[in-house]
């Protein structure tokens, strides 16, 4: 045995965003012929010696961080990447609107605004068909997601969620969908993002996800453009999280 065993993967099926009352299965996948799997839930730490966890009815208490490992002989693997299991529908849905309009000429700017009826400090924006999300806090209980120099790839259906940073795995119901329509002819090819321009995250390495720049309420947002190289639409936002007030 040279070095630790490689880490397994931990996935939630059908999704890690689970409406209250719905079912979900967490599955730990390691190499063939594993002697023992250990699936852990964090905070507080507890474990089951199984490669899966079936949750027939999602409850608030099921939300949180999970990880898994496996044992071969007397050796343990590295732990999987942590999986965040999120309960949705815990709070009433926020509203999502586009400013100045949900019909945007190509090359113009648009801001998607998520507003919660509660004093929540965290908001998440999802685009239908993408695995990534864009999260950021906003002090004034509404999150502005600026999209600068809109391209055709930004067209699509968006939803947002809101939650409190003190309970980061308990989310609201999703907002009603907002359909963003990009009008006008295609412009010249957009710039290709570089590693200097964009933070590289785990999710940004996946196809069809382009990372966004860190944006705070006082910073001028960067241009976010879809590159024709290596990105297949639909276009999405990388999953990023910022502490309140950053």
């Amino acid at each position: 045995q040279s070095g630790p065993l490689p880490k397994p993967s931990l996935q939630a099926q059908p999704s890690s965003l689970v409406p209250l009352g719905q079912s979900v299965i967490l599955r730990c996948q390691g190499p063939p012929d594993v002697d023992l799997y250990r699936l852990e839930k964090l905070k507080p730490e507890k474990y089951e010696d199984q490669d899966f966890l079936f949750i027939p009815t999602m409850e608030r208490s099921n939300a949180g961080r999970y990880r898994c490992s496996y044992q071969n002989g007397s050796h343990w693997s590295l732990p999987s990447d942590q999986l965040e299991l999120i309960a949705t529908g815990v709070y009433a849905k926020p509203s999502l609107s586009a400013h100045p309009s949900s019909a945007v000429p190509q090359g113009r700017d648009v801001t998607l605004k998520c507003q919660s009826p509660y004093s929540f400090d965290e908001f998440v924006l999802y685009k239908e068909g993408d695995t990534g999300s864009y999260k950021r806090p906003e002090k004034w209980y509404r999150a502005n997601f600026p999209i600068i120099t809109v391209t055709a790839a930004h067209s699509g259906t968006y939803r947002c969620y809101s939650f409190s940073s003190s309970s980061p795995y308990l989310w609201s119901a999703p907002s009603d969908p907002l359909v963003l329509v990009v009008t006008g002819l295609s412009a010249t090819p957009s710039q290709v993002p570089t590693e200097e321009s964009f933070p590289v995250t785990e999710s940004s390495r996946r196809p069809s996800i382009l990372p966004t720049n860190k944006i705070s309420t006082t910073e001028k947002p960067m241009n976010i453009t879809a590159s024709p190289e290596g990105l297949s639409p639909p276009f999405g936002f990388a999953h990023q999280h910022y502490a309140k007030g950053n």
Partner: antibody
């Protein structure tokens, strides 16, 4: 109420063998992880070995791996520790302890302990 | 040598407050695992005192409290009493080999 009672300790020569037992009562024994934990005279606590409820999941401290074997008989509500190739440094009070459990989950701490049994390895 | 580090001894007068530290590493306490504390009175088996960093089992007086931060934890005892004189052990879990780990123990002496 929950009770754990160890037995089988005694004086043994280096290289010898001994089998410890722990009789459990007051709870559904087969649902719980249980561990052996030892304490050398005047020293601190050292976890030795753990076994899952069905007996298929077992773990050992590096210091006893290959020499000690943990097992259980759920029909008899009993936990065992077979100790072979004993060394002077294995001299200690051996405790069995139950891991806390809630619903389907096991936790990483010990909520009940036995009173211990003394193992002395000396020529 | 124990995986978790505790001071060998602490002391205090009756009524005083004492704290016992427990320092681990990134593979145990720092990996997110909770810290638990046990009290061992002279000649007896250890007894669970604090679980999950700061929770007290029923029957444990609220003079005992625990906390955790980063790779370390601490146990605080206020209003020290003569019957608190005992050995105190911290315990956690290690992610690398999935083993249970203890501190070396701290002997609390109540003066006077």
């Amino acid at each position: 109420q929950v009770q754990l009672v160890e037995s089988g300790g005694g004086l043994v020569k280096p290289g010898g063998s001994l089998r410890l037992s722990c009789a459990a009562s007051g709870f559904s024994f087969g649902d719980y992880y249980v561990s052996w934990i030892r304490q050398a005279p005047g020293k601190g606590l050292e976890w030795v070995s753990a076994i899952g409820g069905s007996g298929s999941a077992v773990q050992y401290a590096e210091s006893v791996k290959g020499r000690f074997t943990i097992s259980r008989d759920n029909a008899k509500n009993s936990l065992y520790l077979q100790m072979n190739s004993l060394r002077a440094e294995d001299t200690a009070v051996y405790y069995c302890a139950r891991h806390y459990r809630e619903f389907r989950w096991h936790y990483y701490y010990f909520d009940y302990w036995g009173q211990g049994t003394l193992v002395t390895v000396s020529s | 040598q124990s995986v978790l580090t505790q001071p060998p001894s602490v002391s205090g007068a009756p009524g005083q407050r004492v704290t016992i530290s427990c320092t681990g590493s990134s593979s145990n306490i720092g990996a997110g695992y909770d810290v638990h504390w046990y009290q061992q009175l002279p000649g007896t088996a250890p007894k669970l005192l604090i679980y999950g960093n700061s929770n007290r089992p029923s029957g444990v007086p609220d003079r005992f409290s625990g906390s955790k931060s980063g790779t370390s934890a601490s146990l605080a005892i206020t209003g020290l009493q003569a019957e608190d004189e005992a050995d105190y052990y911290c315990q956690s879990h290690d992610l690398g080999a999935h083993v249970w780990v203890f501190g070396g123990g701290t002997k609390l002496t109540v003066l006077g």
